[in-house]
Interface confidence: low
Amino acid sequence: QLLEPCGYIYPEFPVVQRGSNFTAICVLKEACLQHYYVNASYIVWKTNHAAVPREQVTVINRTTSSVTFTDVVLPSVQLTCNILSFGQIEQNVYGVTMLSGFPPDKPTNLTCIVNEGKNMLCQWDPGRETYLETNYTLKSEWATEKFPDCQSKHGTSCMVSYMPTYYVNIEVWVEAENALGKVSSESINFDPVDKVKPTPPYNLSVTNSEELSSILKLSWVSSGLGGLLDLKSDIQYRTKDASTWIQVPLEDTMSPRTSFTVQDLKPFTEYVFRIRSIKDSGKGYWSDWSEEASGTTYEDRPSRPPSFWYKTNPSHGQEYRSVRLIWKALPLSEANGKILDYEVILTQSKSVSQTYTVTGTELTVNLTNDRYVASLAARNKVGKSAAAVLTIPSPHVTAAYSVVNLKAFPKDNLLWVEWTPPPKPVSKYILEWCVLSENAPCVEDWQQEDATVNRTHLRGRLLESKCYQITVTPVFATGPGGSESLKAYLKQAAPARGPTVRTKKVGKNEAVLAWDQIPVDDQNGFIRNYSISYRTSVGKEMVVHVDSSHTEYTLSSLSSDTLYMVRMAAYTDEGGKDGPEFTFTTPKFAQGEIE
């Protein structure tokens, strides 16, 4: 038994560039040749335990055999040299691991960052995968001094072990080395102070101003290497519920500062702020954002009066009428603060005024049959809105001028209303609407539109398949004009039920059918037409179509003494629904006719 290897493979640690050719040789020792009665022609090459084809093998002399591989692509191959001892027993001589890969690419895009309070971190693009163990070393030096090398763990970045020195230029480059080659990146030369990423500003606080409801004052603490750097800021803000940030123009925050007043804000609105900083030259990196801080602008007087309307209740006597003044709460964007109350002033023609302070959104008063002027203002702690003014004419005055060409139509899940204005200048329009039902009263909602508007959508929460009665009233300086109404659906559906048909009169060869209109609660849309289907027990079905304005129809050319089955369907724009089936029998003889 030989204790020493019987021979060796050269090279012993083969590393091959992918796609290239590679030759290995196996040299047998003389002692081995004699011991096993072999020579190099007895050598069998194997890769990963599989025999290499003979055509890749060359016997060089009695001790040496070579094997050649072309276009090497496998990352790792176990290559063994074996002999057939005594001509038949395979004996392992030597084995090596053959690795394949690529020499390192020249690293590119080398950049460095100095996170404030930490050492410098440099990153680069190593290029293509080498498939080999590759060492990346970050080298750095001054003109006169070398710094310790930085050995990269991941091959794409390295944090140096020394603290950066500012205001002195440093040269930095990356060396990449593996078994197939060594390469250096282009070097970069910079002053570390131009690569600083400051820590985020902190202690950000927000205060409002009683004098100006459109501003908020910010103050914060900046680090900037403990005051070594002058920093400029980037300020962003948003309303509390918004998702998108608004940018304060960078040119407004160019100079180093630790406070700033943000202008053009909405009154009584909560804003969220964040801030970050960078070296004032713009070199280096933006800090991360500070923690967010919020503040609310001061209140301002309401920016407009509420929408204002009135309804007259049926009068009990002849001298007085009950008038319900109604108005809408202002949206937050117009209230500019918490509305404390509303001031209503009622003035009778050329007479004394009566002032009411109301916390709700309606006021019912008994008025004589004279003309009145009502004004309404909303009040918060800063002041009152402008007044909305309504003229309430005497009940004896007939309203003139109404809108024309009133139309309503659904679009984009909204119910739109449009009209042509009357020929006289309008102060505003009032739109009122309610669900028509035979089971419940028409509970009205309303909205006000400016004089310039002649197309709008109803802003309430509307339901599908419900019939809405919509009324539009122009309002003039002298009082309301005439009202125009129409019916509309946000979305139609097929009727909930079909008509119930009956016979009004049955003759030998004809029958008059009658039906009631489907109740509005079951219509689910505009009934466009009806269909009447009728048949005998043996005959084919006949269908007639009837306009929706009819409530009766005469079937003619019927057979005498015959049982007929009849059914009706009603159709909206969205489909139809059958009513119950009804049967009738025609008489054998006409009236007065004898067999």
């Epitope: 794409t156 940018q247 713009g282």
Partner: nanobody, 125 residues
Amino acid sequence: QVQLQESGGGSVQAGGSLRVSCVISGFTYRQTFMGWFRQVPGKEREGVAAISTGGGSTIYANSVKGRFTISQDSSKNTVYLEMNGLKLEDTGMYYCAASTVITSVSINRGLYQYWGQGTQVTVSS
């Protein structure tokens, strides 16, 4: 909060084309650097291309130069990667990333703070 949403990935034959998109929301788009990165299982995420949304300057990895184009539509807060002449090795999960810290365009992934969920691109022969 900041959100990046990629779309447009899919399967394509070698030599074909594909366009992936990334919509950015939650911060001021014009202040940003946007990058496309890709990753195959078991390998590190690698930079493909990047763009400065303010100035429009671009950078590309050597492996995609001349085949891929990065562009933006600032009105839609969207960055695109147009990929032509696709090769088998372009297969991978493509990620969109945003950086608000850098001051020059870069495809070093460590400089990007915000990442999308990724969209798969598969190139077959």
